[in-house]
């Protein structure tokens, strides 16, 4: 492999924790217009496994607002609007990266963290366990 | 928002772009009890709007591999296994943060980027447009 020369154009880091503590530019690329998932689609209402979106706010985290899906029913909604309990509404989860202020309240010091969020719900056939 | 007091124990930043460039501890903290709980469900197969997972790979990004859900059908799967085209399988999308080296090959400088990924699929009632 190529030995990468220390580039004079790179930010310098003499931090004793290097390489674990680095500079991160938060001037985000691909900043989308909407951050509220309700604005981007109404699937949460039209799904056979509808969900509500709950605002999870934490000023010590970036992004400070994350929307968490909670399935409205245990079962799935049929064409007639009734709930079919032979099927299950389940949350689809995704692991995401966030930044958490560390130490707390320090405006420019963060730690990378992985958290699990529920993005929406889907309707699944239940697993039936047969008792011998 | 709250005015965060300048804590004397915080790393100092006189960067003119502050708070766009921050110090981040990259020793990733996983808030979940198991290594990766999202990996253990088979909803993608059991859903009435099943999906396949496609690999999106980029060696210059962390995480290097992201899985993209692609709905298997236009319609939704009925109890008898046939597809009902009066309903629609649609992808549920989520905006996630990834890290990219910037400038490239600088060991201690990163940029945060937002990307939109499809996490799974859900079954929705179609929007019917009536022609006057």
């Amino acid at each position: 492999g190529i030995a990468i020369p220390r580039n004079s154009g790179c930010p310098n880091s003499e931090d004793k924790n290097f390489p674990r503590t680095v500079m991160v530019n938060l001037n985000i690329h691909n900043r989308n217009t909407s951050t509220n998932p309700k604005r981007s689609s109404d699937y949460y209402n039209r799904s056979t496994s509808p969900w509500n979106l709950h605002r999870n706010e934490d000023p010590e985290r970036y992004p400070s607002v994350i929307w968490e899906a909670k399935c409205r029913h245990l079962g799935c909604v049929k064409a007639d609007g009734n709930v079919d309990y032979h099927m299950n509404s389940v949350p689809i989860q995704q692991e995401i990266l966030v930044l958490r202020r560390e130490p707390r309240h320090c405006p420019n010091s963060f730690r990378l963290e992985k958290i699990l969020v529920s993005v929406g719900c889907t309707c699944v056939t239940p697993i039936v366990h047969h008792v011998a | 928002g709250i005015a965060i007091p300048r804590n004397s124990g915080c790393p100092n930043s006189e960067d003119k772009n502050f708070p766009r460039t921050v110090m981040v501890n990259l020793n990733i903290h996983n808030r979940n009890t198991s290594t990766n709980p999202k990996r253990s469900s088979d909803y993608y197969n059991r859903s009435t709007s099943p999906w396949n997972l496609h690999r999106n790979e980029d060696p210059e990004r962390y995480p290097s591999v992201i899985w993209e859900a692609k709905c298997r059908h236009l319609g939704c799967v009925k109890a008898d296994g046939n597809v009902d085209y009066h309903m629609n399988s649609v992808p549920i999308q989520q905006e996630i943060l990834v890290l990219r080296r910037e400038p490239r090959h600088c060991p201690n400088s990163f940029r945060l980027e937002k990307i939109l990924v499809s996490v799974g699929c859900t079954c929705v009632t179609p929007i019917v447009h009536h022609v006057a």
Partner: antibody, heavy 117, light 106 residues
């Protein structure tokens, strides 16, 4: 094309340590993890731990916790695995592998470590 | 740890045969299962990732299926170069491998 080239075979005494290197040629480490997997003679594969060289973050298998140290030097695109307090059961071929955190898609050629008095 | 159990531990087959190897996980792992081929004195080689996706450069006679706890690797028409040991591996949690299946010439 990524190639992982490992250091040569080692013979060690019980109680000593061994440090095996793994150099990525044909590119940098990129954002992948590097995992270490060992295989005792005639046996199966056993994951020992991993490092994300970009971050220096390590993750070790419970069995090797406290005895294994994985490090990486990005300037030379080299990862290292050091195993201490060696015993005869540690005689094995040690492999490094590029790890996407979902699968191991590129492997080193392996380094035979023999522990014998 | 998640235990992976392969069967059979060895099998004898002829060139042209259809070969099936199974792998069972001690708990549900969704589709986070990979298959590797290892020849004597060589490093393992990734064949199938995420239960059913063929790694680039791997012949299409190899295929994988399954989800949850039960998985299968199939070689549709065994070729001389396919005689080797095959391992399954889960990555739902810290990685663990099956004990291996040796495919020998009949």
């Amino acid at each position: 094309q990524v190639q992982l080239v490992q250091s040569g075979a080692e013979v060690k005494k019980p109680g000593s340590s061994v440090k095996v290197s793994c150099k990525a040629s044909g590119g940098t480490f990129s954002s992948y993890a590097i995992s270490w997997v060992r295989q005792a003679p005639g046996q199966g594969l056993e994951w020992m731990g991993s490092i994300i060289p970009w971050f220096g973050t390590t993750n070790y298998a419970q069995k090797f916790q406290g005895r294994v140290t994985i490090t990486a030097d990005e300037s030379t695109s080299t990862a290292y695995m050091e195993l201490s307090s060696l015993r005869s059961e540690d005689t094995a071929v040690y492999y490094c592998a590029r790890d996407s955190e979902y699968y191991f898609d590129h492997w080193g050629q392996g380094t035979l470590v023999t522990v014998s008095s | 740890d998640i235990q992976m159990t392969q069967s059979p531990s060895s099998l004898s087959a002829s060139v042209g045969d259809r070969v099936t190897i199974t792998c069972r996980a001690s708990q549900g792992i969704s589709n986070w299962l990979n298959w590797y081929q290892q020849k004597p004195g060589k490093a393992p080689k990734l064949l199938i990732y995420a239960a059913s996706s063929l790694q680039s450069g791997v012949p299409s006679r190899f295929s994988g299926s399954g989800s949850g706890t039960d998985f299968t690797l199939t070689i549709s028409s065994l070729q001389p170069e396919d005689f080797a040991v095959y391992y399954c591996q889960q990555y739902s949690d810290d990685p663990t491998f099956g004990q291996g299946t040796k495919v020998e010439i009949k």
